[in-house]
Each structure stands twice: as C-alpha cells, then as structure tokens.
Amino acid sequence: EQAPGTAPCSRGSSWSADLDKCMDCASCRARPHSDFCLGCAAAPPAPFRLLWP
C-alpha cells in the first residue's frame, strides 16, 4: 500500500513498497511479478477514446 502522506502515482504508474516510489507500469511487461504490477492491473491505462458512439 502507498505510504501515508505521499502523492498518488501518475497515470500509467503504480506504487512500489519494495522501492518506496512510483514505478512505470510499462516495465511490468518485462518483469510482471514486481510488487507494483498488481496495482497496474487494477488500474489500467485510460482506454482509447471511441471515435463513434
């Protein structure tokens, strides 16, 4: 869980308790077991904007 008093991670990143910092979710492709990757799965990047209704 993110440390109290810290700012939330920006979109596309997730908090790592192992490193005490926000980590880029893109790195989960190479190393999916990293502790922060669970947060990436729970909050995926924003979907593409639909071009039709």
């Epitope: 440390a3 192992d18 005490d20 910092k21 190479a30 190393r31």
Partner: antibody, heavy 120, light 108 residues
Framework: EVQLLESGGGLVQPGGSLRLSCAAS????????MIWVRQAPGKGLEWVSY????????HYADSVKGRFTISRDNSKNTLYLQMNSLRAEDTAVYYC?????????????WGQGTLVTVSS | DIQMTQSPATLSASVGDRVTITCRAS??????LNWYQQKPGKAPKLLIY???SLQSGVPSRFSGSGSGTDFTLTISSLQPEDFATYYC??????????FGPGTKVEIK
C-alpha cells in the same frame, strides 16, 4: 566517496546470536534499497536479505527466513542484520551492498565484509 | 527459483588473450543480468549491469551481451589485474536475487 563498512562479525556458538552493522557514508543513505549477501569460505555468493529504502518492506532467502532480521536506521545511515539461532552453515563473510540508482536491478557499492564463524 | 549456471568453472589464460565467460539462466530473465569481479579477500565489484551496460570506471575491455537465457562476459585483452573470479547475477526476480557459481580466471 561512497563507503560501506560492516562490523559485528566474530565467533559464536551454534544457536547463538549476532548483530551485524553496515555504516554508510559518502552518499544520502535513505533513498537506497540495501541487501546483505554472504560468502561461505571458498564458495560463491548467496543473497541473504533485502530492505526497502524506508525499511517498510523486507525479503529473505529461504535459508535464513525466521532466523535473520534486516533493519535500517536512516537517521544513523546504518543497516543491520540480526542473526539468531545460528548454524554452522551460516559461517561466511557477510557483505552489505547498495542498490544502484535507488533500484534493485544491480548493486553498485559493496562493503569489505565481516566474517561470522559459527562453531562450538 | 531461477538457477544460474556459468561456464567454464575455471579458465586458464595468458595476458593479452581474449576471454569469454558464459552465463545461463534456467528461465528467461530478459536483460536483468549483471556481472561482478571478485579478487581474493575483497568485495565483489560491479562490472556490467543490464546485460551490456558498462559500470562507470570499468575499463572498456570488458563487455557484456545477451538476453533471455544466454549471456556472455568478454574481456578483449586480458590484463594482469583481471585474474579473478567472475560472477553473473540475475535481478529478474528482485528483490530476491541469485548468483552464478562463478568462473575463476587464472594464469596459464
């Protein structure tokens, strides 16, 4: 100059306890994850334990889980390893090392090591 | 757990030789592979990180390559100070890491 200096090693009987220290200098200690690695006489390197920069998260090798405790005091720039229920197979030189760039992908600075001998 | 193997265990070489050490992982570790040099009675020294990046201050005769499961450390022209034991280390499973058994480079 980055320096890591281990201390606290020595001769201890099986079942005994020992507390190792690793004093850091020459860099800001608090943002860096740290590890302990050991090397039995004439053998290779074995990872022992990991601690996050804040000290809030720790990990251990199966061989020491439940017996060793890693901790840190960022106000004193010091890393610790509390070793309980020591066994003959814990005999080794113990090194502390710093996670490079504040990550755990590689370890760029190591101490000179402190020898722990477990024997009756 | 990820197992690391190295070959050869011991390598006899002469000053000026080109030396290659191989490290193999039991599963793919991408490029999360580091190389260390250790001399007797001394701490390990980081040479190469992320499979092929040269650590600051390390001579350019050292180079690393590979990805996935197979990696190599090459010393282009062996110098007297290079006689030592070399370890590979995977950080794919970090914070838990594993080292290879080491390769001793000795004088022929």
């Amino acid at each position: 100059e980055v320096q890591l200096l281990e201390s606290g090693g020595g001769l201890v009987q099986p079942g005994g306890s020992l507390r190792l220290s690793c004093a850091a200098s020459g860099f800001t200690f608090s943002p860096y994850p740290m590890i302990w690695v050991r090397q039995a006489p004439g053998k290779g390197l074995e990872w022992v334990s990991y601690i996050s920069p804040s000290g809030g998260k720790t990990h251990y090798a199966d061989s020491v889980k439940g017996r060793f405790t890693i901790s840190r005091d960022n106000s004193k720039n010091t890393l610790y390893l509390q070793m309980n229920s020591l066994r003959a197979e814990d005999t080794a030189v113990y090194y502390c090392a710093r996670g490079g760039d504040g990550y755990f992908d590689y370890f760029d600075y190591w101490g000179q090591g402190t020898l722990v001998t477990v024997s009756s | 757990d990820i197992q690391m193997t190295q070959s050869p265990a011991t390598l006899s070489a002469s000053v000026g030789d080109r030396v290659t050490i191989t490290c193999r992982a039991s599963q793919s570790i991408s490029s999360y592979l580091n190389w260390y040099q250790q001399k007797p009675g001394k701490a390990p020294k980081l040479l190469i990180y992320a499979a092929s990046s040269l650590q600051s201050g390390v001579p350019s005769r050292f180079s690393g390559s590979g990805s996935g499961t197979d990696f190599t450390l090459t010393i282009s022209s062996l110098q007297p100070e290079d006689f030592a034991t070399y370890y590979c280390q995977q950080s794919y499973s970090s914070p838990g890491i594993t080292f290879g058994p080491g390769t001793k480079v000795e004088i022929k």
